[in-house]
């Protein structure tokens, strides 16, 4: 990989660095529930409240995505291979990465009911 | 339809730099990464880097981030790649593609390639 | 970097007749292959992506497979037009890297 991340998971999804806690990263997923049909597309948003903004990069089960940074992951033509958790990670120049939570992507074929939650391992 | 259309050859001097458009229609610009890729006559794909058009962030093969400089302009969904201090070794097609972090996405499409040819 | 050394570089074979190409990857790349087709004007096409899933508008005699790290494109029965060069490409981590290419030639 380009670079590579040694994470301290902690129970609330945070990485923190240090001492004292530092805000949460929110990972947003649209559509709700990160249920998509094939092909359709998946949108991360990965909110970070530390200014100046920190550079995002982006996991998939764990493994860091071969991604240029950027707040926002667009996921388009969904198949079955990109099916997984993702997550966010937030590095500024003061502190360490903080991961997000991790949300789970998955295809609903037509008929099925999409999970009501994407959330994996915390909110 | 998706189209990639990149600019015509170049015959530059060695010392100077050359600007290679690759302009995108068919799609959402700002939903898709460009790819930059080098072809020596004769020769491999060599991977350039990548950027976001979206974000502007891009990621390089370390060989070509002093070489190549990337750069998007969402207004008129046309992607650049910018080679400075040109020697005869930049004497290449550049191709760029359309790619995304989805596996039907990757490398997906193609530019056409845009000849330049670095001479005295 | 992950090396992915292609075989062979170039391969003679007639009409009708079934090859593969080979790339071997020196570290694990998961499915993150594809398979790519330029012609002599230089056009490049992606024929498979994902290792083995085939790009709509691709003849169904092309078709990909991996044994541990060795990724193949079989062409089940060639066709004139399929007389080319061939890449393998890396996607699973940077830089991304590519075969150094099959050149396919009539026999």
């Known amino acids: 990989m380009g670079s590579s991340h040694h994470h301290h998971h902690h129970s609330s999804g945070l990485v923190p660095r240090g001492s004292h806690m530092l805000e949460e990263v929110q990972l947003v997923v649209e559509p709700e529930g990160g249920a998509v049909a094939p092909g359709g597309t998946v949108t991360l948003t990965c909110e970070v409240p530390a200014q100046p903004s920190p550079q995002i990069h982006w996991m998939k089960d764990g493994v860091p995505l071969p991604l240029p940074p950027s707040p926002v992951l667009i996921l388009p033509e969904i198949g079955p291979q990109d099916q997984g958790t993702y997550s966010c990670v937030a590095t500024h120049s003061s502190h360490g990465p903080q991961e997000s939570r991790a949300v789970s992507i998955s295809i609903i074929e037509p008929g099925e009911e999409g999970p009501t939650a994407g959330s994996v391992g915390g909110s | 339809q998706v189209q990639l259309q990149q600019s015509g050859a170049e015959l530059v001097r060695p010392g100077t730099s050359v600007k290679v458009s690759c302009k995108a229609s068919g799609y959402a610009f700002n939903n898709y990464l460009i790819e930059w890729i080098k072809q020596r006559p004769g020769q491999g794909l060599e991977w350039i880097g990548v950027?976001?058009?979206?974000?502007?962030?891009?990621n390089h093969n370390e060989k070509f981030k002093v070489k190549a400089t990337l750069t998007a302009d969402k207004s008129s969904s046309t992607a650049y790649i910018q080679l400075s201090s040109l020697t005869s070794d930049d004497s290449a097609v550049y191709f760029c593609?359309?790619?995304?972090?989805?596996?039907?996405?990757?490398?997906?499409?193609w530019g056409q390639g845009t000849l330049v040819t670095v001479s005295a | 970097d992950i090396q992915m050394t292609q075989s062979p570089s170039s391969l003679s074979a007639s009409l009708g007749e079934r090859v593969s190409l080979t790339c071997r990857a020196s570290q694990d790349i998961g499915s993150s292959l594809n398979w790519l087709q330029q012609e002599p004007d230089g056009t490049i096409k992606r024929l498979i992506y994902?290792?083995?899933s085939l790009d709509s508008g691709v003849p169904k005699r092309f078709s990909g497979s991996r044994s541990g790290s060795d990724y193949s494109l079989t062409i089940s029965s060639l066709e004139s037009e399929d007389f080319v060069d061939y890449y393998c490409?890396?996607?699973?981590?940077?830089?991304?890297?590519f075969g150094s290419g099959t050149k396919l030639e009539i026999k």
């Open positions: 593609a359309r790619s995304a972090g989805t596996a039907r996405a990757r490398f997906a499409y």
């Open positions: 950027i976001n058009p979206g974000s502007g962030g891009t």
């Open positions: 490409l890396q996607y699973a981590s940077f830089p991304f890297t």
């Open positions: 994902a290792t083995s």
